[in-house]
Amino acid sequence: MNGRVDYLVTEEEINLTRGPSGLGFNIVGGTDQQYVSNDSGIYVSRIKENGAAALDGRLQEGDKILSVNGQDLKNLLHQDAVDLFRNAGYAVSLRVQHRLQVQNGPIGHRGEGDPSG
């Protein structure tokens, strides 16, 4: 019996204050460096230990960053996205998309708590 994997997608606004060494995370993606097939979005690839993002705790590796200080990250070259973050100022507002994996029961059986119910 195979289990079915669903994804619960949520969005969140995260406000970070730039620390002494910056925001404290790495990104991948962009129109010239697609991280996800057919998706040129910007994704968090690493949260640096003891950095601003890690200390805040909400941003996670694998999150998709939709906007920075209200500026959409769609259709940006990787370099341009990096520059946008680096020039974002002291207080940085991130609109992010979390994608949580939800493991459900066997196919044909909808278990309790199944979000598709």
């Epitope: 060494s21 910056g22 991948v28 690839s45 640096k48 370099q79 973050f85």
Partner: nanobody, 127 residues
Framework: EVQLVESGGGLVQAGASLRLSCAAS????????MAWFRQAPGKEREFVAE????????WYSDSVKGRFTISRDNAKNTVYLQMNNLKPEDTAVYYC?????????????????????WGQGTQVTVS
């Protein structure tokens, strides 16, 4: 373990050009972000320029933007720093540095704590 060896430094007049080279060995060169830092007498080491081939990015400090150009030759495992219109304040020991950037681009300004490997440095003096 990556070894870095810088060359190309020297004594030049203000307004002249120099090209520094940094030869790397012991790693998969194209997977490394390569950078140049410099340290002037009595000052802290500061970032100059960075090139990440795998992540399609370059980055310069404001003090060298428009005058210095970083480039790399992955076939030769070498990174270069072309320095034009040199000024006396460019006098420093120039260091090549590297780190493996498989985990994407840092959104923070380059910080020497990110770099795992360093060369011994080459002296540039502008009179």
């Amino acid at each position: 373990e990556v070894q870095l060896v810088e060359s190309g430094g020297g004594l030049v007049q203000a307004g002249a050009s120099l090209r520094l080279s940094c030869a790397a060995s012991g790693g998969t060169f194209s997977s490394y972000a390569m950078a140049w830092f410099r340290q002037a007498p009595g000052k802290e080491r500061e970032f100059v320029a960075e090139d990440s081939w795998s992540n399609h990015r370059v980055w310069y400090s404001d003090s060298v933007k428009g005058r210095f150009t970083i480039s790399r030759d992955n076939a030769k495992n070498t990174v270069y720093l072309q320095m034009n219109n040199l000024k006396p304040e460019d006098t420093a020991v120039y260091y090549c540095a590297a780190y493996c950037d498989y985990s994407g681009s840092t959104v923070d300004p380059p910080n020497q704590s990110e770099y795992d490997y360093w060369g011994q440095g080459t002296q540039v003096t502008v009179s």
